[in-house]
């Protein structure tokens, strides 16, 4: 077992909230069996750990929220992988398995005597994890012990099913909404024939299923649909790309309901195979506006249109985060590892000194350099605040007129907490209202981003539109600069006057050949020619028949 996974970040408190963040990348295919995680992550990992720690500090110093109660946390690393996250969740559960008859914090020995060992406080709820597939696995375990779970980026539609995932809630909308947004974009640009790719796992599979269902209803055809694991090897991505090229030049648009690292895998394959610029990628919020997806592969990503959950940067987080230094940040056990990875240098004399780096870290290094805030930071913070407000409301109803934890609230009953959480309604970190519907979901608001070349070798994401409760707004001029630049992704061009569509056996309805009607036929509908009755002839526009005027021949008329 790899030691990095046993590392836990603790913050003491009267009530402990658990959290699962992807502090490290998921294990590569060859390391899955030993659950050996990948490299440390900044946005999805370290920033989220720090957000949890600092948000709890803010909550604890707010006299109006949970007065006289200190919130603490236990943060574990999910590595964006189900097996690792389950292993870590079992550790959370272990803390919650103290019998309710026992004196809190006292462990009874097998022989009946008391032990002076103080056990850890149980986890009352869990924030995260990020991935839908992982969140489902974790929820399957947590709900057995009535532990509410609030997710900040697990958007799979399956998680809306309260019969299956009773203790699951989220501060983000279900993917059904972004699938709709993606279809609306495809429709807007008359792309009737597109290829489809999704990340294997719940997020990609359920999202793509919704995209396909909605596309079919809108007359959009899928040339072919492919799936791939985010951690698949180069060869798998290369083969997938070669398959996508077989649908060119017709299916130039590739709808990708993908995690960010799947998109990166595709971009890398485009580079290897010499396919930059051949496709326009339409990506879901797994890509959004992440630089870790496009870094080093900007040319391949240019033109990409992505969906991003609406969430402005949180200024106060940056004010806190950018001051952090390895000499003083001791409460985040992954921080030294991250610092060395971020600056590719060695922290000499530190407990976690990494000898693989030759260069020594100098004291002038700062996180301000190339800083990018996690695009889902607002959601992470809102999830933590939701837990706090839920506990606050629970305390108000169970301990009226009492500041702090009253006996009625000890030990915290997960069922009552869930009830309280579902009724939560507060103003989120960005000024928006945070509330949950009957499925524990939040409303859907998205930004539409476009990855563009802004200048020579300078690329960036530009906000080109929004999708809010079913309404798509797009700045077409920003995306295409002129109408003639709009990419075409169609199987067959419309037929000319007097022609009908002939769809070959086994082909999708968007692919046809155009065949002219016979001389005495008119176009009855787009698939059928019909002969005019005797004595009539097709009209000039070939949409019907006109009677042939009767001409009587006289003896002296010239030959026709």
């Amino acid at each position: 077992q790899s030691s990095e996974r046993r590392v836990v970040a603790h913050m003491p408190g009267d009530i402990i909230i658990g959290a699962l963040f992807s502090v490290h990348h998921q294990p590569t295919v060859d390391k899955v069996h030993e659950r050996k995680c990948g490299a440390v992550r900044e946005q999805y990992g370290i920033q989220r750990v720090e957000a949890m720690l600092h948000t709890l500090e803010r909550i604890n110093s707010d006299p109006t929220l949970l007065p006289n109660i200190t919130l603490g946390c236990e943060i574990r690393d999910s590595c964006w992988h189900s097996a690792v996250a389950l292993e870590q969740s079992i550790e959370f559960i272990r803390d919650s398995l103290i019998s309710s008859e026992e004196e809190e914090g006292l462990v009874r020995c097998v022989d009946g005597s008391s032990s002076s060992f103080r056990s850890k406080k149980p986890i009352v709820g869990v924030i995260g994890p990020g991935s839908s597939s992982v969140a489902i696995q974790v929820q399957n375990l947590l709900q057995l012990f009535n532990i509410p779970q609030i997710a900040y980026s697990a958007t799979s539609m399956d998680l809306s099913d309260k019969t299956l995932f009773k203790y699951f809630m989220r501060v983000v909308p279900s993917d059904a909404q972004q699938a709709r947004a993606m279809v609306d974009i495809v429709k807007r640009y008359n792309w009737t024939y597109v290829s489809a790719v999704h990340t294997e796992g719940n997020y990609g599979e359920s999202g793509m299923e919704a995209f396909k269902d909605m596309s079919a209803k809108e007359g959009i055809c899928i040339a072919h649909s492919y799936k791939i694991y985010s951690n698949a090897g180069e060869q798998s991505f290369d083969k997938l790309l070669k398959k996508l090229t077989s649908h060119l030049p017709k299916a130039r648009v590739v709808a990708c309901f993908c995690e960010g690292m799947t998109v990166r895998g595709l971009l890398m394959a485009m580079r290897r195979l010499g396919l930059a610029g051949e496709f326009l990628l339409l990506g879901s919020d797994g890509w959004a506006d992440r630089y870790d997806v496009t870094d080093g592969y900007q040319r391949e990503a240019v033109g990409g249109i992505t969906i991003k959950l609406q969430s402005p940067d949180v200024k106060w987080f940056d004010d806190y985060y950018l001051k952090l230094r390895p000499e003083t940040n001791h409460r985040n056990p992954w921080f030294q590892e991250f610092w060395q990875h971020r600056f590719q240098c060695r922290l000499e004399g530190f407990p976690q000194e990494n000898s693989k780096y030759n260069k020594t870290c100098n004291s002038s290094l700062t996180l301000k350099t190339h800083h990018v805030q996690d695009s889902k930071m607002g959601f992470v913070i809102n999830a933590i605040y939701s837990m706090a407000y839920g506990l606050h409301n629970m305390q108000m109803s169970l301990c009226p007129g009492y500041a702090g934890l009253c006996d009625a609230m000890k030990p915290i009953d997960g069922r009552k907490l869930l009830e309280s959480l579902m009724k939560t309604n507060f103003t989120g970190v960005s000024g928006d209202t945070i509330l949950f519907d009957e499925n524990g979901d939040s409303p859907g608001r998205y930004e539409i981003m476009n990855f563009k070349e802004m200048g020579k070798d300078y690329f960036d994401y530009i906000n080109v539109g929004s999708w809010d409760n079913g309404e798509l707004k797009m700045d077409d001029d920003e995306v295409w600069s002129k109408k003639s630049n709009i990419i075409r992704s169609v199987c067959s061009e419309p037929c000319e006057k007097g022609q009908i569509k002939v769809i070959r056996k086994g082909e999708v309805s968007c692919c046809w050949t155009c065949t002219p009607c016979k001389e005495n036929e008119y176009v009855f509908d787009e698939y059928t020619c019909k002969a005019c009755q005797l004595g009539s002839w097709p009209t000039d526009d070939l949409t019907g028949c006109d009677l042939i005027p009767v001409q009587y021949l006289r003896w002296g008329d010239p030959e026709p």
């Epitope: 090229t245 060119l248 051949e278």
Partner: antibody, heavy 115, light 110 residues
Framework: SLEESGGRLVTPGGTLTLTCTVS????????MSWVRQAPGKGLEWIGI?????NTWYANWVKGRFTISKTSTTVDLKMTSPTTEDTATYFC?????????????WGQGTLVTVSS | AFHMTQTPASMEVAVGGTVTMKCQAS??????LNWYQQKPGQPPKLLIY???KLASGVPSRFKGSGSGTEFTLTISGVECADAATYYC????????????FGGGTEVVVK
């Protein structure tokens, strides 16, 4: 069908444009490659123009050749040719919009570089 | 950089015999390997595409096999008309390529 033209005797350092004229082929659906063969030598791939118009070249080309196209022609522009560039130049159609296999070839046009 | 290696450079075979030539890619190309036949004064002609598929009009005595980096072209029941130079070509990538073609194998029929 494909027909190459423009091959002639050229002096080193000049410029030369070879043209591949296509008939019955939609260049917006197929990629086109240029391949050359020096006398008594093997086939050497120069580069490709995809259906999309994007171009790729062999590493050794280093900017000496440029491929472009219209709706009915594919051009190969040679700048500063050397005697090493003496060869028969073929254009060939790829079976796909990008790169896969070359299923249709022209007869070739001979370029001789000599002072 | 990507390159293709063909062996042998030349070989002799008697009419009715069998000939086998090899092609090696510098990195894996799945089954995106094609074989061409070229006779003097003529352009190359596609024989086999995607490692094992016979191009239209090509006799079944030509057989291609292999995947990844190792590929083989076998001609059984060799005829006089098979005297030619055979080239393999990767159809995998156009990026960082020295030559998509192998050096060729000349087949002399006795």
């Amino acid at each position: 069908s494909l027909e190459e033209s423009g091959g002639r005797l050229v002096t080193p350092g000049g410029t030369l444009t070879l043209t591949c004229t296509v008939s019955g082929i939609d260049l917006s659906s197929y990629a086109m490659s240029w391949v050359r063969q020096a006398p008594g030598k093997g086939l050497e791939w120069i580069g490709i123009i995809y259906a999309s118009g994007n171009t790729w070249y062999a590493n050794w080309v280093k900017g000496r050749f440029t491929i472009s196209k219209t709706s009915t022609t594919v051009d190969l522009k040679m700048t500063s040719p050397t005697t090493e560039d003496t060869a028969t130049y073929f254009c060939a159609r790829d079976s796909s919009a990008t790169f896969n296999y070359l299923d249709l070839w022209g007869q070739g046009t001979l370029v001789t570089v000599s002072s | 950089a990507f390159h293709m290696t063909q062996t042998p450079a030349s070989m002799e075979v008697a009419v009715g015999g069998t000939v086998t030539m090899k092609c090696q890619a510098s990195e894996s190309i799945d089954t995106y390997l094609n074989w061409y036949q070229q006779k003097p004064g003529q352009p190359p002609k596609l024989l086999i595409y995607q490692a094992s598929k016979l191009a239209s009009g090509v006799p079944s005595r030509f057989k291609g096999s292999g995947s990844g980096t190792e590929f083989t072209l076998t001609i059984s029941g060799v005829e006089c008309a098979d005297a030619a130079t055979y080239y393999c070509q990767q159809g995998w990538s156009t990026n960082d390529v020295d030559n998509v073609f192998g050096g060729g194998t000349e087949v002399v029929v006795k």
